[in-house]
């Protein structure tokens, strides 16, 4: 195991000004032991609402790299392979938890952060607003 | 703030048998301050690959509630509102980080865990395997 250095500038479990502090074992347990890592790797190309993946990188965050989906078209791909603007490609978003060092440069003190990521795109019927 | 009870059955930062233990502040910082909470709330109904949301609840996990998508159909909804089985509804999956109480029921001791969640569904062209 490791011993956590008592750096005076870094919080510890007795610090009443460091609210809701818990201890976390960073040995990640993987619950998805039988999943195929290539599971949905080509959906971004085969979808009627295809998307590109963009790298969002921040070395001070864990995970440092997050892949963000951006829909390729405003419309959706029809049976002829053309973009149909009567339908809309929209991103499916999810809030995920990430870790961030806080205060920065303290090796064993982190803060949970929620960020919104676009995971992929889906094709939806547009909401039509009728002018009265 | 809170004080962390010294429950003898729960590990603390000096416990050499609790590897890679760090302090994490659970006062979650939300980077998505300007996002609309209803952002994609009705996509599951309007999509050509609609899905149902199932509540996955586990009091020993943080977050304790995760909403899982299950595609409603094998095929996709066509312009006539019927299911077209020449296309496939497939789940878009993502691995996310969660915290799990470890040992169970210890209020301030967790382990990082990776789980695979289905966020929504998209409509894809099927892969056709030709028989030789």
């Amino acid at each position: 195991g490791i011993t956590i250095p008592r750096n005076p500038g870094c919080p510890n479990s007795e610090d009443k000004n460091f609210p809701r502090t818990v201890m976390v074992n960073l040995n990640i347990h993987n619950r998805n032991t039988n999943t195929n890592p290539k599971r949905s790797s080509d959906y971004y190309n085969r979808s009627t609402s295809p998307w590109n993946l963009h790298r969002n990188e921040d070395p001070e965050r864990y995970p440092s790299v997050i892949w963000e989906a951006q829909c390729r078209h405003l419309g959706c791909i029809n049976a002829d392979g053309n973009v149909d603007y009567h339908m809309n490609s929209v991103p499916i978003q999810q809030e995920i938890l990430v870790l961030r060092r806080e205060p920065p440069h303290c090796p064993n003190s982190f803060r949970l952060e929620k960020i919104l990521v676009s995971v992929g795109c889906t094709c939806v019927t547009p909401i039509v607003h009728h002018v009265q | 703030g809170i004080t962390i009870p010294r429950n003898p059955g729960c590990p603390n930062s000096e416990d050499k048998n609790f590897p890679r233990t760090v302090m994490v502040n659970l006062n979650i910082h939300n980077r998505n301050t300007n996002t609309n909470p209803k952002r994609s709330s009705d996509y599951y109904n309007r999509s050509t690959s609609p899905w149902n949301l199932h509540r996955n609840e586990d009091p020993e996990r943080y977050p304790s509630v995760i909403w899982e998508a299950q595609c409603r159909h094998l095929g996709c909804i066509n312009a006539d509102g019927n299911v077209d089985y020449h296309m496939n509804s497939v789940p878009i999956q993502q691995e996310i980080l969660v915290l799990r109480r470890e040992p169970p029921h210890c209020p301030n001791s967790f382990r990082l865990e990776k789980i695979l969640v289905s966020v929504g569904c998209t409509c894809v062209t099927p892969i056709v395997h030709h028989v030789q």
């Epitope: 890592p37 070395p59 995970p63 | -």
Partner: antibody, heavy 124, light 109 residues
Framework: QVQLQQSGPGLVKPSQTLSLTCAIS??????????WGWIRQSPSRGLEWLGR?????????DYAVSVKSRITINPDTSKNQFSLQLNSVTPEDTAVYYC??????????????WGQGTLVTVSS | EIVLTQSPATLSLSPGERATLSCRAS???????LAWYQQKPGQAPRLLIY???NRATGIPARFSGSGSGTDFTLTISSLEPEDFAVYYC??????????FGQGTKVEIK
């Protein structure tokens, strides 16, 4: 099981281009869960990462600052291989060159499969 | 660029003894992106540990890793004859920052 097989000349003249190829079996160069990289090793520099390619709806190329102006890594999807080109070589580029698979889940990063290594000598 | 400094440069031990190898980073790195490799003469490096403490497939339990922040350790609990080799740590900070330590040679005393 995944294997990497390297090929290419062991002797290159100064100012010329070093070219090596790495053939992949048991995995795909366009896999979305891996990146494919080149690493070299010399007594003076130790192990030095040179660069990688990875495919995520398009090809991403990442190169070490030390060689950025001289390096190109290209995929060949038809042959399921990738190549290294290092231009304007000098005797300082003499090293054993390795290709490797970098496991590229966002949660971990490490090289789990390595090629056999190719000793490249830069000399006239 | 993050510099990884390994110590000692050489470790002279007998079979059955415990080996403790250190890897110190010039700035904080995520433990999840810290790996250890073993290299024998004329061979490519072989992955031992990833994520600072996870044993790679097929690696014996006598190898263990620990640490976080800037200080990481590889421990071989009881040296076997085949463990005498050079050991390297490696970090990934960003897509353009990936570095190796200079290595620790574990030799037979």
């Amino acid at each position: 099981q995944v294997q990497l097989q390297q090929s290419g000349p062991g002797l290159v003249k100064p100012s010329q281009t070093l070219s090596l190829t790495c053939a992949i079996s048991g995995d795909s160069v366009s896999s979305s869960s891996a990146a494919w990289g080149w690493i070299r090793q010399s007594p003076s520099r130790g192990l030095e990462w040179l660069g990688r390619i990875s495919y995520r709806s398009k090809w991403y190329n990442d190169y070490a600052v030390s060689v950025k102006s001289r390096i190109t890594i290209n995929p060949d999807t038809s042959k399921n291989q990738f190549s290294l080109q290092l231009n304007s070589v000098t005797p300082e580029d003499t090293a054993v060159y390795y290709c490797a698979r970098e496991v590229d889940s966002i949660y971990y990063s490490y090289f789990d499969i390595w090629g056999q290594g190719t000793l490249v000598t830069v000399s006239s | 660029e993050i510099v990884l400094t390994q110590s000692p440069a050489t470790l002279s031990l007998s079979p059955g003894e415990r080996a403790t190898l250190s890897c110190r980073a010039s700035q904080n790195v995520w433990a999840f992106y810290l790996a250890w490799y073993q290299q024998k003469p004329g061979q490519a490096p072989r992955l031992l540990i990833y994520g600072a403490s996870n044993r790679a497939t097929g690696i014996p339990a006598r190898f263990s890793g620990s640490g976080s922040g800037t200080d990481f350790t590889l421990t071989i609990s009881s040296l076997e004859p085949e463990d005498f080799a050079v050991y390297y740590c490696q970090q990934y900070r960003s897509t353009l920052s990936l570095t190796f330590g200079q290595g620790t040679k574990v030799e037979i005393k």
